[in-house]
Amino acid sequence: AVNGTSQFTCFYNSRANISCVWSQDGALQDTSCQVHAWPDRRRWNQTCELLPVSQASWACNLILGAPDSQKLTTVDIVTLRVLCREGVRWRVMAIQDFKPFENLRLMAPISLQVVHVETHRCNISWEISQASHYFERHLEFEARTLSPGHTWEEAPLLTLKQKQEWICLETLTPDTQYEFQVRVKPLQGEFTTWSPWSQPLAFRTKPAALGKDT
């Protein structure tokens, strides 16, 4: 649709994956489209097939190598093209000069675990996954705790303005079931955004000892 609105958004996970979403008003669901990636200073190029995720939206992942390999740097520019089949030919629909380290979205943190739990406190740790060594310590985290009777959207956000892969939750209620999530974001990049939330970690605080105020 020439006068319709389209959107082509891609993010680099800082290692070996570029995830892209292409949407276009009025586009047909069965349209066959691809994303082509052409780096300006690499010998490789890569293609992925856009698969429908909603009525007028398609997504795919450009797998650039082994998950922990450092395939791009801050000086790389990758020309990304959306090509859609029109009859017998492929038509270029969109082009973006993609600066990987300006468009970062890391993988969700993994390996969440309860390090220590008490009646009112819980210490939780996690790990970051497939994050570039270029960041060194220049990462921040957001965490949230789901309390009984509330939704995730209602949970207050706890901000960790440094690379700290643990948190001590306090003022919890004894003998209560909670869930915990965390996400990560590099400080670098004009269009950088938060990672997806981690898988929730369920934990229960210890019951208060009878006759004692803990």
């Epitope: 020439v2 959107q7 520019i77 969109a94 973006q96 000069d97």
Partner: nanobody, 123 residues
């Protein structure tokens, strides 16, 4: 904010050539890809060509492919549209527009617009 000013329009005979310029000023303009659109009297605005700043990748409308060439001069913050083998149906008001990240053929994908420059092709 980005400001765009087109120039170079005029009256030309069919088969002739003309070069339009789009000069830009404002915040980090070299990050914004640029497109040319045109609007003939009584018709809708239509896509002509577009270019990305960094790689110089280009996109053309089928009606002008092979006749028009879009280029850019990063040092001058200027985008050019070289129009050759002009036809009377190329007569229109030509606009340049800047997109935030991506060039497409859709005018709604462009955020900043110039005022336009008139091109008239006589037969």
């Amino acid at each position: 904010q980005v400001q765009l000013v087109e120039s170079g329009g005029g009256l030309v005979q069919a088969g002739g050539s003309l070069t339009l310029s789009c000069a830009a000023s404002g915040r980090a303009f070299s990050n914004y890809p640029v497109g040319w659109f045109r609007q003939a009297p009584g018709k809708e605005r239509e896509f002509v060509a577009a270019i990305t700043w960094l790689s110089g990748s280009t996109l053309y409308a089928d009606s002008v492919e092979g006749r028009f060439t879009i280029s850019r001069d990063n040092a001058k913050n200027t985008v050019y549209l070289l129009m050759s083998s002009l036809k009377p149906e190329d007569t229109a008001l030509y606009f340049c527009a800047a997109a935030l990240k991506t060039i497409t053929r859709g005018q709604n994908d462009y955020s900043y617009w110039g005022q336009g420059t008139q091109v008239t092709v006589s037969s």
